[in-house]
């Protein structure tokens, strides 16, 4: 930054409120597409463009002019593997966080004309093309149909769709929130021959129901009903096919062949939560008890003899937990070897710490190719002769990411392969590898601005740079921005993480207010490297707040002995962790300890909620955004996973303890600002309804705002402005800032 | 290399049953469907009937009563069968690969005379 | 049962001639139609599948089109090997059912 240290003699101006809103600094992306091993697809002025990844020429793939004529806004663009087609997606309609109906239309690159005849129907809910060739599956009013060329009719594949009750090659509300976080539940295998696809059954599922008021026109409101399984209700049940797409007729129906659960699984209550084509005769599944500390793989193979898929129990793998539940979210995807018969996995090792393990089909243990106190985030890619993944070792800052190679041969052999590339701008990476693995795009997000470079993995030389954010860089230096600080304090001998936002200027001799911006959840983790223009920014650099945020007990990435401390107990140590360090923070000598404040959105709703409830008088005021309340009102598959079943046999005894409601009474001692989405398909509306109840009971004055048919991300662009302006003269006024 | 090699034709006797093999290689009958069609001499093509990959069957009314189509997946082996067979059998039979909705290999033909 | 009439049962052309070749369905079966060569030796193979989409090795001069009732089958250049009877033949619907055939010849 240029200007000086004394702020009063910096003439720029700060990072306001309308910057953010309006996204005046705009961070640039390199958001590319790869179509083969060594070419991919990028987007420029509405050129696609095709680029040569040794040498960086480019060409153009196709003209921003070629659909002119159209008459539809195309929302998005897919080319088929052979880069025949372009399927066009326009007409989109969104419905929860991954799913939407779309139109589509093919255009042939050959003859550049659109197909015209056998047109994917309108509100299709999914399509896909095969890892191969042209084929493309579909799904439209819940069945999954085929097509074997884009101008020939489609092969229908199931019949028993039937809207918010049985779901083929699609996901249901729960399974697509918590398990695939995705709308799709088809998955070709790698040549194209066969379609595997899960099928839900939600008849016996609860609905949710909450009004939508539309237009002001509408007299009526109408009545959303949604299947959402909330804890310990009836869940969806789930069944596993596959088909040959080469035996498709159109006078005869599809056989789809079912894999079912193992036998471990279909005692009880159950999830299918991974499927993974192994070769492309060979595929695996993971299943998941309800109590998700038990999960099984199975590997199953085509038998060609018979047109049947067999797995043996031999080759059955079994994951579980005893601290907690299996995987961070869910169990880890298996990353096989070219000929099937291995596979890598990320699991818990002996200490608590998510590392690869190297497991052969047919041997029950497995063989850890990383250890220590850090964990593996996510394999990458896997070659003949190197592993690639993403980890939090380098430095020991579990809030860093890099990306490193280890030799198959000899897994003593690893290399970090961007911690030296640029380490004071650069500790948060992510990457994107080409189709076999020769390039890689590596996408640096902080501490600086962000940074695109292409690689080549040869020799893992830097080939170019893709964006710099320059221009960008350029317009904040004539910003007093803030700087983040990330460091950790020591607690029952334990290192915990927390980051700062300081504003400009900071001086450590003067007391500032302070924002703790909460998320908390299992596996959060909300102290990182990273960059980030957003209300924090605002806060720090025009407010002179200082917004930090802290990952306590159940936070991620730092081994199990801290993320599992929550099992059972949600509501309680990651509680008591935010309010411990807003303790930690005032000593610090730089706090203004009459004036800290708290927020969170959906489970930081929660914990700021109950925070703000503990009676702890460290906070003035707090804000929750779509807060759960009380863990019966949200979902199955989420709040079971870290709370057990609202039993008395199992854990009714802490979901009663651990509601917002019970604390109302401690309500009165802060200031409170409650907001939620009326159409909140996920944290229901009724979350925050309760607490309002329950403070109106008891007397307590507090302020509230219901976004009228927002869901839980209240994103649309009135409502965005309109929340982050209100809680804005919150936290002002709870400050008394001018 | 996709192949169906045919064979049992020959000279029959009306009223005797007559059994026609077709032995796929490069694909597995348990994916694809065979078909068997006919050709009388200097006559057009006539459709018999098919058996699918999982097994199901279909046939032509004409041919209900006395014709079926099996398979012995093990053998990569379709067969037809034909009983009570009468002059007007007298064709070359074709078996031939389901693809989708066309048959995209054919056999070689056998043929068949039913002559007293 | 769907009737397929082709015409002409017979035709005679010269190399190099623009040759076509009609089939009609007694019933609308939009694009399911296929269209099949008979080589004198008896030996069938697919030349045009779901109308005009050209099978895999099949020269580019034959060419299919239509839907509905009416198709067509295109030969644009004519080589000697293209000798054969031509048959067309509907997939929508069971029984499947065949063109009463076309035989070209070379004049």
């Known amino acids: 930054n240029k200007g000086t240290d004394d702020a009063t003699a910096d003439s720029r101006k700060t990072y306001t409120l309308t910057d953010y809103l309006k996204n005046t600094y705009r961070l640039k992306l390199y958001s590319l597409r790869w179509i083969s091993d060594h070419e991919y697809l990028y987007k420029q002025e509405n050129n696609i463009l095709v680029f040569n990844a040794e040498y960086g020429n480019s060409s153009v793939f196709l003209e921003n002019s070629t659909f002119d004529e159209f008459g539809h806004s195309i929302n998005d663009y897919s080319i088929s593997p052979d880069g025949q087609f372009i399927l066009l997606e326009y007409n989109y309609v969104k419905q929860w966080r991954h799913s939407y109906t779309a139109s589509y239309d093919i255009y042939d690159l050959n003859k550049r004309q659109l197909i015209t005849e056998e047109r994917i129907p309108n509100n299709t809910q999914w399509v896909t093309w095969s890892p191969v060739g042209h084929k493309l599956a579909y799904v439209w009013n819940n069945d999954i149909y085929v097509k074997i060329e884009p101008n020939l009719p489609s092969y229908r594949i199931t019949w028993t769709g039937k809207e918010d009750i049985i779901y083929n090659g699609i996901t249901d509300w729960v399974y697509e929130e918590e398990v695939f976080s995705a709308y799709s539940a088809l998955w070709w295998s790698p040549n194209g021959t066969f379609l595997a696809y899960a099928q839900f059954n939600d008849t016996e599922v609860p609905l949710i129901e909450y009004s939508f008021y539309s237009d002001e026109s509408l007299q009526y409101p109408k009545t959303v009903r949604v299947p959402y399984p909330k804890a310990g209700a009836v869940n969806p049940t789930v069944k596993f096919f596959v088909v040959n797409t080469d035996s498709l007729s159109s006078v005869t129906n599809a056989t789809s062949i079912q894999i079912t659960a193992p036998a471990s699984m279909l005692i009880g209550d159950h999830y299918l939560c991974d499927v993974t084509w192994a070769t492309q005769e060979r595929i695996s599944l993971q299943w998941l008890r309800r109590i998700q500390n038990y999960s099984v793989m199975d590997i199953c193979d085509y038998d060609e003899s018979s047109g049947r898929w067999n797995c043996l129990v031999a080759r059955q793998h079994i994951e579980m937990s005893t601290t907690g539940w299996v995987g961070r979210f869910r169990p880890s995807e298996p990353h096989f070897t070219l000929d099937g018969n291995s596979f890598y996995k990320i699991i818990s090792n002996e200490e608590g710490y998510r590392h690869i393990c190297y497991f052969q089909i047919d041997k029950k243990d497995c063989t850890f190719i990383t250890k220590g106190t850090w964990e593996v985030i996510g394999i990458e890619a896997l070659t003949s002769d190197y592993l690639y993944y993403i980890s939090n070792e380098y430095k020991g800052m579990p809030g860093g990411r890099n990306l490193y190679k280890i030799q198959l041969s000899d897994y003593t052999k690893v290399t970090c392969l961007s911690c030296e590339l640029n380490p004071e701008r650069c500790q948060y990476y992510s990457v994107s590898f080409s189709k076999e693995a020769k390039y890689y795009q590596l996408r640096c997000s902080g501490p600086g601005l962000p940074l695109y470079t292409l690689h080549s993995s040869v020799n893992d030389k830097g080939l170019r740079v893709l964006e710099d954010n320059s221009a960008l860089d350029k317009m904040l230096q004539n910003v007093q921005m803030p700087s983040k600080k990330l460091d950790f304090i020591i607690l029952n001998e334990t290192k915990f993480w927390y980051q700062m936002i300081l504003p400009p200027h900071f001086d450590k001799s003067k007391k500032y207010p302070l924002l703790l911006d909460v998320y908390a959840g299992p596996c959060s983790q909300k102290a990182d490297t990273v960059f980030r223009l957003n209300w924090a920014t605002y806060l720090a650099s025009t407010e002179n707040i200082i917004v930090a945020s802290f990952d306590g007990r159940g936070s991620g990435y730092q081994g199990d002995k801290i993320m599992h401390a929550i099992n059972r107990r949600l509501g309680t140590f990651e509680v008591e962790d935010q309010i411990e360090a807003a303790r930690q923070f005032s000593k610090m000598g730089f706090v203004d300890n009459k004036r800290i404040a708290i927020w969170g959105w959906s489970y930081g709703g929660y914990v700021t909620s109950m925070v703000l409830g503990s009676g702890s008088g460290v906070f003035k005021c707090g804000i929750a955004v779509a807060p759960v309340s009380r863990w019966e009102y949200y979902d199955s598959v989420y709040t079971e996973r870290y709370m057990g079943l609202p039993t008395p046999e199992d854990n009714l005894d802490h979901y009663r303890n651990s509601t917002v409601m019970s604390r109302a009474e401690n309500f009165k001692q802060v200031e409170y600002l409650l907001i939620h989405g009326t159409a909140d398909d996920n944290v229901h509306f009724q979350q925050s309804a309760q607490i309002s109840k329950a403070l109106v009971d008891v007397g307590v004055d507090f302020q509230a705002m219901w976004y009228t048919d927002e869901d839980h991300g209240i994103a649309s662009s009135t409502a965005h402005q309109h929340i982050y302006t209100h809680m804005s003269h919150f936290i002002k006024q709870c400050f008394s800032l001018p | 290399e996709v192949q169906l090699v045919q064979s049992g034709g020959g000279v029959k006797q009306p009223g005797e049953t007559l059994r026609l093999t077709c032995t796929a290689s490069?694909?597995?009958?348990?994916?694809?469907?065979v078909h068997w069609v006919r050709q009388a001499p200097g006559k057009g093509l006539e459709w018999v009937g098919v058996?699918?990959?999982?097994?199901?069957?279909d046939y032509d009314a004409a041919f209900m009563s006395r014709v079926t189509i099996s398979k012995d997946t093990s053998k990569s082996t379709a067969y037809l069968q034909m009983n009570s067979l009468r002059a007007e059998d007298t064709a070359v039979y074709y078996c031939?690969?389901?693809?989708?909705?066309?048959?995209?290999?054919w056999g070689q033909g056998t043929t068949v005379t039913v002559s007293s | 049962d769907i009737q397929m009439t082709q015409s002409p049962s017979s035709l005679s052309a010269s190399l190099g001639d623009r040759v076509t070749i009609t089939c009609s369905a007694s019933?609308?079966?939009?694009?399911?139609l296929n269209w099949y060569q008979q080589k004198p030796d008896g030996a069938v193979k697919l030349l045009i599948y779901?109308?005009?989409n050209l099978h895999s090795g099949v020269p580019s001069r034959f060419s299919g089109s239509g839907s509905g009732t009416d198709f067509s089958l295109t030969i644009s250049n004519l080589e000697p090997e293209d000798i054969a009877t031509y048959y067309c033949q509907q997939s929508i619907k069971l029984p499947f059912t065949f063109g009463s055939g076309t035989k070209l010849e070379i004049k």
């Open positions: 031939m690969r389901n693809r989708h909705d066309w048959f995209d290999y």
């Open positions: 019933q609308g079966i939009r694009n399911s």
């Open positions: 058996i699918w990959g999982d097994g199901r069957t």
């Open positions: 490069g694909f597995s009958l348990t994916t694809y469907g």
């Open positions: 779901y109308s005009s």
